[in-house]
């Protein structure tokens, strides 16, 4: 059995342009004033980190600045949004969710979102 | 200050029944997973039993060696968890802690297994 | 279930060494690991958490790291207090699984 319920879709289309959104929920045990959220790529049986953020329950979620993430949260939901997403970025993206303050220490894995890109097809020549 | 103080150890017969308790405090019990693990010189530590909390309807889980046999139970009013522990074995023998999540630990309370 | 392998299972070093204790997980376990001191005669101490976040009240000397399959520990600058047996333990699927422990000594 895995440790703390963390749900999110199934499966998601990006936009034509490279923009994907899901939420991720989790089940808190606990009142947890310290939430970290890390998105994960998995493909073939490689797992990296796409992006992470640790937010303070009540405040906005702060990615890196060079991040291709962005998000909200509203109580145990997390709104992720992925920007620059290409063909040969489509793959599961699991969320991770920790709860890191006060004790204890409570972390839940998602089953993964599978994300379709799609490239969009240049536009054709015009002859004036 | 948190404390956790197990008690209810001691020397058992094989086959026969014990009853391991746990009190807490310093710590909002009611937030807790609360678990048993055990301490044996040939085992190192190992992970006995847990107990969720009410958002998880008070789930419990057991590690293959003690299912069927042994039962976890709390009662938040008393910021108490439980272990009732069926037909011991002399491979049930070591020191049982008390966890909240796995950040706090008891004392521990031994129980021996022996005719 | 998750087997932990850790290693070594025993180690000796001088004060003012640095020693690294890794552990091995049969899966990716996402990073759900806990590291933690167990002295003689006392209770098992919760020093590291979810791979890398160091518990209240333990020495900034010890570090944790990995993901996927492999974490390791860290101590730094080593005491005569760090004498003890370390554990790892897969944190995110029951059965909660320990390594073997590591025996650290003093030379």
């Known amino acids: 059995c895995k440790a703390m319920h963390v749900a999110q879709p199934a499966v998601v289309l990006a936009s034509s342009r490279g923009i994907a959104s899901f939420v991720c929920e989790y089940a808190s045990p606990g009142k947890a004033t310290e939430v970290r959220v890390t998105v994960l790529r998995q493909a073939d049986s490689q797992v990296t980190e796409v992006c992470a953020a640790t937010y303070m329950m009540g405040n906005e979620l702060t990615f890196l600045d060079d991040s291709i993430c962005t998000g909200t949260s509203s109580g145990n939901q997390v709104n992720l949004t992925i920007q620059g997403l290409r063909a040969m970025d489509t793959g599961l993206y699991i969320c991770k969710v920790e709860l890191m303050y006060p004790p204890p220490y409570y972390l839940g894995i998602g089953n993964g979102t599978q994300i379709y890109v799609i490239d969009p097809e240049p536009c054709p020549d015009s002859d004036f | 200050e948190v404390k956790l103080d197990e008690t209810g150890g001691g020397l058992v017969q094989p086959g026969r029944p014990i009853k391991l308790s746990c009190v807490a405090s310093?710590?909002?019990?009611?937030?807790?997973?609360m678990n048993w693990v055990r301490q044996s010189p040939e085992k190192g530590l190992e992970w006995v039993a847990q107990?969720?909390?009410?958002?998880?309807?008070?789930?419990?889980y057991y590690s293959d060696s003690v299912k069927g046999r042994f039962t976890i139970s709390r009662d938040d009013s008393k910021s108490s968890v439980y272990l009732q522990m069926n037909n011991l074995r002399t491979k049930d023998m070591g020191i049982y802690y008390c966890?909240?999540?796995?950040?706090?630990w008891g004392q521990g309370t031994l129980v021996t297994v022996s005719a | 279930d998750i087997q932990m392998t850790q290693s070594p299972p025993s180690l000796s070093a001088s004060v003012g060494e640095t020693v690294t204790i890794t552990c091995g997980a049969s899966e990716n376990i996402y990073g759900g690991l806990n590291w933690y001191q167990r002295k003689q005669g006392k209770s098992p101490q919760l020093l590291i958490y979810g791979a890398t976040n160091l518990a209240d009240g333990m020495s900034s000397r010890f570090s944790g790291s990995g993901s996927g399959r492999q974490y390791s520990l860290k101590i730094s600058r080593l005491h005569p207090d760090d004498v003890a047996t370390y554990y790892c333990q897969n944190v995110l699927n029951t059965p909660y699984t320990f390594g073997g422990g590591t025996k650290l000594e003093i030379k």
């Open positions: 966890t909240g999540g796995f950040t706090y």
């Open positions: 107990i969720r909390n009410k958002p998880y309807n008070y789930e419990t």
């Open positions: 310093g710590f909002t019990f009611s937030d807790n997973w």
